[in-house]
């Protein structure tokens, strides 16, 4: 007897973080034997949507013409082949921004920081919120932090970073949210440019030194203060 059908791949274009009113396309890719694709949304009646496969039958498109609160959430997809339904895909978390007013992002003591020292990014909201998210432009893992103060409403969140290295430099934004839906975020804060100057680093070349300047896990503050990461929006904890 054959084993279970391999799970499909689920992704969103242009991405999984979408501003209110913008369009998004959800793709589910299975196998060439797929006859039908099904998309389920957590806490919604299943199936949320069904689609026939696009030629050559190995994927289906689910379109959202205008992003609203109703579409934000956690999705999984399946495909049906002649032998039955596949395993579920890994979840896709579709996040809508623009649900609340934008917070303010600042750097303490300054956005100009010397390599080898520390900097704390402070995200402040006008109204009390319980979840704050920090993102870095062009990062390999753009959603850096989800933090929750165990339901406690606060006006700010601190994101400590140390030691700062050259890859921490770049443009950051933050979002705020309420715990009842981790998929609804505020408008983004105005961008904050973090500039890393000087160097306390070893000047000798390292044989394993990365030549890529793209921001990756290396520039990510991995332990948000006082937080217990939620399952939703979790991007880079182990």
């Amino acid at each position: 007897q054959a084993g279970p059908l391999p799970k499909p791949t689920l992704w969103a274009e242009p991405g999984s973080v979408i501003s209110w009113g913008n369009s998004v396309t959800i793709w589910c890719q299975g196998t060439l034997e797929a006859r039908e694709y099904r998309l389920d949304k957590e806490e919604s009646p299943a199936p949320w949507d069904r689609q026939n496969p696009l030629e050559p039958k190995n994927k289906a498109r689910f379109s959202i013409p205008s992003m609203t609160e109703d579409y934000a959430g956690r999705y999984r997809c399946y495909y049906r082949s002649p032998v039955g339904w596949s395993q579920p895909s890994d979840p896709l978390e579709l996040v809508m921004t623009g649900a609340y007013s934008k917070p303010t992002l600042s750097a303490l003591p300054s956005p100009l920081v010397t390599s080898g020292k520390s900097v704390t990014l402070l995200c402040q909201s006008r109204s009390p919120m319980d979840t704050f998210l920090l993102i870095k432009e062009r990062a390999a893992h753009p959603l850096l932090h989800l933090r929750s103060e165990h339901g406690a409403q606060q006006h700010q969140a601190e994101f400590p970073m140390s030691p700062v290295t050259s890859v921490h430099g770049g443009t950051y934004r933050c979002f705020s949210s309420h715990g009842f839906s981790h998929y609804l975020l505020s408008h983004p804060s105005d961008p904050l440019e973090l500039i890393v100057s000087g160097s306390l680093e070893d000047p000798r070349p390292s044989p394993t030194r990365s030549v890529s300047t793209a921001a990756g896990p290396e520039d990510q503050p991995l332990m948000p203060t006082g937080s217990v990461p939620h399952s939703g929006l979790r991007r880079h904890w182990e």
């Epitope: 030691p163 680093e201 990365s210 290396e218 991995l222």
Partner: antibody, heavy 118, light 107 residues
Framework: EVHLVESGGGLVQPGGSRKLSCAAS????????MHWVRQPPEKGLEWVAY????????YYADTVKGRFTISRDNPKNTLFLQMTSLRSEDTAMYYC???????????WGQGTSVTVSS | DIQMTQTTSSLSASLGDRVTISCRTS??????LNWYQQKPDGTVKLLIY???KLHSGVPSRFSGSGSGTDYSLTISNLDQEDIATYFC?????????FGGGTKLEIK
């Protein structure tokens, strides 16, 4: 579960060399900066070196700069400390530790002992 | 380098006591202060990071506070398993530096 296991310690003559290894498991090694910290007998902890997750940033304590080299092999989940021109004051228990990105070291190995003596 | 001073090198207390260990830094470290526990067998564990944040799995009887140059670790309701040496460490500026340690013993 995060697990760090150091190896490579032992008795070394003054002026000699030694390479320590730290095998990591239970987490995505390539996503974390790593440290070496040492503790001389009956003394406190002393930070030795740091290497960022992609090896693009490396820092040393002044006491070891020019003599020690920290490196890592991400595909093999292994951290290294190459020690040369060893001195009696380098005698210590050497620990590897995982960096958090917030100035702390959240998981430590059990340590490997290095004795520099003739 | 930032100097770290733990003025009390050893401390004796009774089970159930509330114990406070102090750490002073030579300059403002902006709350980048961490506390570690080293057991007699050499095992080192992170207890508190960023002054007051409890590391996962650490009992809630441990707490941290402070700002600027003065920080403290408090153990409420001292337990037998808390017998260890406690080190503070600043993570504000490399090189990272440790306090000399405070050895906690049971009366």
């Amino acid at each position: 579960e995060v697990h760090l296991v150091e190896s490579g310690g032992g008795l070394v003559q003054p002026g000699g060399s030694r390479k320590l290894s730290c095998a990591a498991s239970g987490f995505t090694f390539s996503s974390f900066g790593m440290h070496w910290v040492r503790q001389p007998p009956e003394k406190g902890l002393e930070w030795v070196a740091y290497i960022s997750s992609g090896s693009s940033s490396i820092y040393y304590a002044d006491t070891v700069k020019g003599r020690f080299t920290i490196s890592r092999d991400n595909p093999k989940n292994t951290l290294f400390l190459q020690m040369t021109s060893l001195r009696s004051e380098d005698t210590a228990m050497y620990y590897c530790a995982r960096g958090t990105g917030t100035g702390a070291m959240d998981y430590w190995g059990q340590g490997t002992s290095v004795t520099v003596s003739s | 380098d930032i100097q770290m001073t733990q003025t009390t090198s050893s401390l004796s207390a009774s089970l159930g006591d509330r114990v406070t260990i102090s750490c002073r830094t030579s300059q403002d470290i902006s709350n980048y202060l961490n506390w570690y526990q080293q057991k007699p067998d050499g095992t080192v564990k992170l207890l508190i990071y960023y002054t007051s944040k409890l590391h996962s799995g650490v009992p809630s009887r441990f707490s941290g506070s402070g700002s600027g140059t003065d920080y403290s670790l408090t153990i409420s309701n001292l337990d037998q398993e808390d017998i260890a040496t406690y080190f503070c460490q600043q993570g504000n500026t490399l090189p990272w530096t440790f306090g000399g340690g405070t050895k906690l013993e049971i009366k």
